[in-house]
C-alpha cells in the first residue's frame, strides 16, 4: 500500500477519506487505527457502528470520529481539534472476523496554526451555542508519499 499524506492545521479539524470497493467490502465494519512504530501493531482508535447497516452513523472516540458511506465506498475519519501529538501513521481498515484488511495507509501531518503568534485579543472563539465543527473549516490537503520517502524516522 502507498501512504497518503493528509495535512491539517493545529487546533482545527482534519478530514481523512479512504475510498474502497463497496462490493468487495460489503457487509464489513471499518476501523481507524494508529500504527505504533514502523513494524509495530496498529492500535484501534475508533470503529464504525456494531451493526453494519448503521455504519453511516458517526461514532466518536474522544476527538476522533468515523463514518462510512457503504454504498459510495468512502470511509471518512474526522480528527477534531488537531494537536501535534496526532501526527503519525494510521490505517483505514476493513474488518472481517478478527482480521483487518488495510484500505489505505495515512500519514497525518500537523501544521502550526498561523494564528498562534497573534495576541489573544485577536483570536475568535466560538460562543457557547456554536458547535466547534461549525466554527472551523476542515482542512484536508493530501498527497502520496514519494518513492523512497519513509513515514517513520530511521531507528538506530
Amino acid at each position: 500500500h502507498n501512504t497518503t499524506v493528509f495535512q491539517g492545521v493545529a487546533g482545527q479539524s482534519l478530514q481523512v477519506s479512504c475510498p474502497y470497493d463497496s462490493m468487495k467490502h460489503w457487509g464489513r465494519r471499518k476501523a481507524w487505527c494508529r500504527q505504533l512504530g514502523e513494524k509495530g501493531p496498529c492500535q484501534r482508535v475508533v470503529s464504525t457502528h456494531n451493526l453494519w447497516l448503521l455504519s453511516f452513523l458517526r461514532r466518536w472516540n474522544g476527538s476522533t470520529a468515523i463514518t462510512d458511506d457503504t454504498l459510495g465506498g468512502t470511509l471518512t475519519i474526522t480528527l477534531r481539534n488537531l494537536q501535534p501529538h496526532d501526527a503519525g501513521l494510521y490505517q483505514c481498515q476493513s474488518l472481517h472476523g478478527s482480521e483487518a484488511d488495510t484500505l489505505r495507509k495515512v500519514l497525518v501531518e500537523v501544521l502550526a496554526d498561523p494564528l498562534d503568534h497573534r495576541d489573544a485579543g485577536d483570536l475568535w472563539f466560538p460562543g457557547e451555542s456554536e458547535s466547534f465543527e461549525d466554527a472551523h473549516v476542515e482542512h484536508s490537503i493530501s498527497r502520496s508519499l514519494l518513492e523512497g520517502e519513509i513515514p517513520f524516522p530511521p531507528t538506530s
Partner: antibody, heavy 123, light 107 residues
Framework: EVQLVQSGAEVKKPGESLKISCKGS????????IAWVRQMPGKGLEWMGI????????RYSPSFQGQVTISADKSISTAYLQWSSLKASDTAMYFC????????????????WGQGTLVTVSS | DIQMTQSPSSVSASVGDRVTITCRAS??????LAWYQQKPGKAPKLLIY???SLQNGVPSRFSGSGSGTDFTLTISSLQPEDFATYFC?????????FGQGTKLEIK
C-alpha cells in the same frame, strides 16, 4: 439461481500440470470472493485460499502457498485452481465455494458450492 | 492456525431423536462459526452461520449456539434426510479451518 459449475474429473500423472475451473452464474461474479476447498478421500475439508474476481486479490492458506495458483477471469465469470507439477498426494475432491459476507457479524461463510472436481494423480 | 475439534466423531441415532454435536475452537472465535452438512458424493451445504443464524431454506429443527470456544449444533427431531456428515468452520481468522467432521448414522 446461483450456480457454481466445476470442470470434470481429471486423471493425471505425477509431475504433470493441471488447471481446473469453476464458473459462476445467477449472480454478480465480480462482487463475491470465491474459495477453493480440498477434501482428500474419506477426510475432512481444508481451506486452500480465496480470490476476489473483481480485482484478483488473492489469499492463500500457508499450507497451500506455493503449491497451487488461484486465478480468475472475470470476463467469463470463471475462477481457476492450478498446479504446475502434481503429486500423488494431490489426489482429492476440490470444491469451489462462494464466500458471502453476512452483515450481522461482518464475517464470511460459504453459501454456495460447486459440485466438486475429482483429481486423481497416479503413475 | 485455529484448530477446530468436533465431538463425537460419529453418532448413531433414530428418526425423531434429538441430537447434539459439539465443536471446540483452540482459541476464542467470538461467534464467527458456521455449520455445514455434507452427504456422500455431494458438496457441503451451509446450515448455520454466525454460530446461531439459520441459513435461508434450512429447516427450523436445526439450531446453533455458543460463543468463544464452545459451540453446539442441535437437530431437535431427526428426519431421514438428516443422516450425513456435519462440519463446523471458524470464520475468525485466516486460514479458515474446519472441524474433522461428525458422521450421523442411522441406529
Amino acid at each position: 439461481e446461483v450456480q457454481l459449475v466445476q470442470s470434470g474429473a481429471e486423471v493425471k500423472k505425477p509431475g504433470e500440470s493441471l488447471k481446473i475451473s469453476c464458473k459462476g452464474s445467477g449472480y454478480s461474479f465480480t462482487s463475491y470472493w470465491i474459495a477453493w476447498v480440498r477434501q482428500m478421500p474419506g477426510k475432512g475439508l481444508e481451506w486452500m485460499g480465496i480470490i476476489y474476481p473483481g480485482d484478483s486479490d488473492t489469499r492463500y492458506s500457508p499450507s497451500f502457498q506455493g503449491q497451487v495458483t488461484i486465478s480468475a477471469d472475470k470476463s467469463i465469470s470463471t475462477a481457476y485452481l492450478q498446479w504446475s507439477s502434481l503429486k500423488a498426494s494431490d489426489t482429492a475432491m476440490y470444491f469451489c465455494a462462494r464466500q458471502r459476507t453476512f452483515y450481522y457479524d461482518s464475517s464470511d461463510y460459504f453459501d454456495y458450492w460447486g459440485q466438486g472436481t475429482l483429481v486423481t494423480v497416479s503413475s | 492456525d485455529i484448530q477446530m475439534t468436533q465431538s463425537p466423531s460419529s453418532v448413531s441415532a433414530s428418526v425423531g431423536d434429538r441430537v447434539t454435536i459439539t465443536c471446540r475452537a483452540s482459541q476464542g472465535i467470538s461467534s464467527w462459526l458456521a455449520w455445514y452438512q455434507q452427504k456422500p458424493g455431494k458438496a457441503p451445504k451451509l446450515l448455520i452461520y454466525a454460530a446461531a443464524s439459520l441459513q435461508n431454506g434450512v429447516p427450523s429443527r436445526f439450531s446453533g449456539s455458543g460463543s468463544g470456544t464452545d459451540f453446539t449444533l442441535t437437530i431437535s427431531s431427526l428426519q431421514p434426510e438428516d443422516f450425513a456428515t456435519y462440519f463446523c468452520q471458524q470464520a475468525d481468522s485466516f486460514p479458515r479451518t474446519f472441524g474433522q467432521g461428525t458422521k450421523l448414522e442411522i441406529k
